[in-house]
Structures are given as C-alpha cells and as structure tokens.
Interface confidence: low
C-alpha cells in the first residue's frame, strides 16, 4: 500500500497562536488526505474530515501538540485509505517562561574545535530541545539535569564547521507534558572562525586618543569580504559594517566609535553575505588607549 | 606573485613512506588554511587533507586517515604531506592549495607519486 | 559525507554555444561550493567561490548560480581554450568533495 508523507511547514516547532500547514503527499499523486492525532488533547477540527493538498492548523494552542499521521485517498485499497503516513510531532511553544542560552567558552568558535551549549532555567524543566534556525530536521531533544535552582543541560558540540554554526535557541519541557514547550531562549549566533585569512586592523587618528576624542578604526583586506565585524575583548556584541572597495584594491570599513572614555583591546573579522556564520581568522589585537581627562566628562 | 611548487614525489613501494613538500612564496603563508588534493589517473579530483593557519585544525580523507599526516612550518613557509602505508591506489598528481575567500585559489603545479612493484 | 553528483561526464559543444554544467548536493551546503577548471598537464584553476562569486581573472562568460543542493556553472559564448575538465567542490562540511568531473569537448 502507497504510504504518504506528511510534513509541516515552516516547522514542527510551533510558537502557541500561530499557524503551521500540514501537507500530505502520496506518491501515487492523490491529494485527498485524513488526519489523525495519536496523543495528546484531542483537535476536534481534525475529525470525519477530508482535507486537499494541504491543512492549515491555528492559532495553535497547547492542545494542538502530539503526534499527527495522515491517511491519503486510495481508490484500489479495501478501505478506500493508504497505510498511515510517517508521525509528525507539533510541538508548541510558549507555554512556560524561557530558559537561557549560552555558550561556553564563548560564541566564536575557532574551525575546529568544539564549543559548549549551555540552556539553564529556573523552572524544573525535566528535558530541553535545542534547534537551529532554518533547519527543518527536529530538534535535538536533551535531557535535563534537575537541581534546586532549577535545571539546566550542557550539549557538546563539534567539530566546528559551518554545517554547525548558525542561529540557536533552546526550550524547555516536562516529562507529562513533553510537547508543550517552553518560549524560545533568546537566540544565540554560533559563528565558526579561521575559515579565511585575517584581515588589518588600524585607527585614526591613532591608537592612543585623549578621552572624549573622536576614533575610527578601519577593518580592511585584499579578501572579498562583504562584511566586518568589530568586537571589543570582554565585550559580548560586535558592530558589523558592509565592506566598501577602495581605490588601492582593498575592501575596508570604518567603524566610527565616536568620543572614546574607556580603551579596550579591538580585532576585527570578515564574512561573506551568503555564508553569514562563517568568518575569518582575527585581525591582530589592536589595543586602543585614553589618555587624559575630557574636558566636557 | 603567489607560488606553490610541491616536490617529494616518485616511484615508492607498496607500503613504502613519502614525504611531500609545498614551498609558498608571495604571500603571507601563516595567514592562511593549506590543502592537499590528488587527481589519479583517469579520475577526478579529490581532496585529501586541511590544516588550519596555526596547525590547531586538520582535517583528512577517510582513505588516508592515520596513514598520512598533515603539517607546515609557518618561519620555512613550507607545507608538508607525510604518507605511509602507501597503496596502489595512492598513485596520483599531488597538489598543494591554499584556502582563501571560500576556495582553493592558488594551487602548485603538482608532484607525481607512483605506488609500484 | 557529502556527495557532490556531476551527472553528466562528457559535454559536446561549438565554439559560441552556451552550455551549462550542474552539480547536485546530496544535502544542503547552502552557497558553499566552488567550481574548478583543469586542462591536461595544468593544475586547477578557480573559476567561482561561494556558489556565484567569480574569481579574479577569470571571463565574464563563466557563470555560477544555485543554492541549497542545486548549483550550476554556465559558460556562455564558449572559446577552445575552455575545453578543459570542470569540478565542483563543496566546502561546507569536512570532508570536502569534490564532484567526479565534467569534461567539455568539441562536437
């Protein structure tokens, strides 16, 4: 008997209020399909009904999480329906507050190497689901390890490619409740470096400024970069400026930090737009130093 | 002017050991990820090991793992490929290349290694 | 691994045809693929870097398009000098692969 595959799209992981289309196909080409949902609430909108092509569930709620398989029509069958099709599970999101993402040592995470991701909450959560943005593949479901501040899971990964970097966000769940899941952690870019040789860092006017005085620093290389991004040592964030091309041949850009108080250690990668999670080897540190007092502090 | 030129190849025994060598002038060798590709004859082209600017990353072909061995000497701006255990299948035109802007953008002019009784 | 499927292994053209050359991913590689030329007794030259980036130097005739498991090298207007062996190379997971080849001759 044809079995048919059911998909869903955008996803299986489904913000609660939203929608998420069901689709249905049999490679026999009927497009009339019956859905079921094996656990979970029931979804009465579901039931004695035919469906073509495609079903459109929402506004989602906790009751619409679980399994779902569809039956398509199947005219040289006894019953008139194919064999069931693959399980899909909905999960939805939203229902509890969301944990926090972090990585371990840090999001930057050399060709190579192995980064560790770390989703905690104060909310006893018994297991975590990590997924990557843009990945239609469920998510990675871990478990969780209990204490009396609430949970928390470690996940270990690499070798550091660009297949692995990306945008993450983790969620939680309880075991009773394991489709219900938490709102997203706030998202995390993993970003794979050294892909690419290190471009120049230098300031104007110079590295050492007077506090309150105005310096840019200029991110340049003979690579055809789209992108630089400027980080400070000890500084979470970077600035990320589109790559300009100059008169010499060198692609450049100029990170304007206007009235400079505090000095820091800077470097500098590029990127390609197309491959936005994938940068270069850093440029050497440059070390940029305040002298004096501004007048106007 | 950027240059490869690799050197080491030659007619080895099956089981025998080889060592390439990849000479790079014209740019900043300790900038740069470094490749090893081999074309056999008659064949394709195929990829057979990276090593990172600083040497903390390599990478090889499941075909060779543990039989070759990838380094470099960023002062000598030299690249090396240390093969044993060699095979018939090993014979091939072996390149150096260097990794830049997403791609393999200058390669050497190649060095024959020929796995023969 | 990564397979890198170049169906077709000899392509017959004229000097002034168009011709396309395709290369499919067996999963995602988002843009990470680059296209090689090789003629006999010459090392590879890079001809696109990121799926649709054209090196320096290399003609305004090669062009590279395609994303996700699809990509495409076409050349238009084709001279005798690009009678040559073309490859396509994936670069988003380790190990690399590289297609098996698509040799472009004379008709």
């Known amino acids: 008997q044809d079995k048919p595959f059911l998909s869903a799209w955008p996803g299986t992981v489904v913000s609660e209020g939203q929608h998420v289309t069901l689709q249905c196909r049999s490679r026999l080409g009927f497009n009339e399909f019956s859905l079921s949902k094996e656990d979970g609430m029931p979804v009465p909108e579901l039931y004695n009904r035919i469906f073509r092509n495609s079903f459109l569930m929402g506004p989602v709620t906790p009751a619409h999480a679980g399994t779902y398989r569809c039956c398509s029509s199947h005219p040289h069958s006894p019953t008139g329906w194919s064999a069931p099709s693959n399980p899909v599970v909905i999960m939805v999101t939203g229902v509890h507050r969301k944990p926090s993402l972090l990585a371990h040592p840090g999001p930057l995470v050399k060709s190579g190497e192995t980064v560790i991701l770390q989703c905690w909450s104060d909310v006893r959560f018994e297991r975590f689901l990590l997924h990557r943005e843009g990945i239609t593949e469920d998510p990675l479901r871990l478990v969780g390890q209990l204490h009396d501040a609430g949970s928390q899971v470690n996940y270990s990964m690499g070798p550091m490619t660009p297949a692995l970097a990306g945008t993450y966000r983790c969620f939680g769940s309880v075991t009773h409740l394991p489709y219900e899941l938490s709102a997203p952690s706030d998202p995390l870019d993993i970003v794979v470096v050294g892909l690419y040789g290190k471009p120049s860092l230098s300031a104007q006017p110079g590295p050492t400024v007077q506090a309150g005085e105005n310096v840019t620093l200029s991110c340049s290389s003979r690579s055809l970069f789209d992108i630089y991004h400027l980080s400070r040592e000890a500084e979470a964030g970077e600035l990320r400026l589109t790559a300009v091309l100059r008169v010499n041949g060198t692609f450049q850009a100029n990170f304007p930090l206007g009235p400079v108080t505090h000095g820091g250690n800077y470097r500098c990668f590029g990127s390609f737009r197309a491959l936005p999670h994938a940068w270069s080897d850093p440029s050497d540190p440059l070390p940029v130093s305040v002298t004096g007092n501004s007048r106007n502090l | 002017d950027v240059q490869l030129v690799e050197s080491g190849g030659g007619l080895v025994q099956p089981g025998g050991s080889r060592k390439l060598s990849c000479a790079a002038s014209?740019?900043?060798?300790?900038?740069?990820?470094m490749h090893w590709v081999r074309r056999a004859p008659e064949k394709g082209l195929e990829w057979v090991a990276f090593i990172s600017s600083d040497s903390t990353t390599i990478y090889y072909t499941d075909t060779v793992k543990g039989r070759f061995t990838i380094s470099r000497d960023n002062p000598k701006n030299t690249l090396f490929l240390q093969m044993t255990s060699l095979r018939s299948e090993d014979t091939a035109i072996y390149y150096c290349a260097r990794f830049y802007d997403g791609a393999m953008d200058y390669w050497g002019q190649g060095t024959s290694v020929t796995v023969s009784t | 691994d990564i397979v890198m499927t170049q169906s077709q292994k000899f392509m017959s053209t004229s000097v002034g045809d168009r011709v396309s050359i395709t290369c499919k991913a067996s999963q995602s590689v988002r843009t990470a693929v680059a296209w090689y030329q090789q003629k006999p007794g010459q090392s590879p030259k890079v001809l696109i870097y990121?799926?649709?980036n054209r090196h320096t130097g290399v003609p305004d005739r090669f062009t590279g398009s395609g994303s996700g498991t699809d990509f495409t090298l076409t050349i238009s207007n084709v001279q005798s000098e690009d009678l040559a062996d073309y490859f396509c190379?994936?670069?988003?997971?380790?190990?690399?692969?590289f297609g098996a080849g698509t040799k472009l001759e004379l008709k």
């Open positions: 014209g740019f900043t060798f300790s900038y740069f990820g």
């Open positions: 990121l799926a649709s």
């Open positions: 190379l994936q670069h988003w997971n380790y190990p690399l692969t």
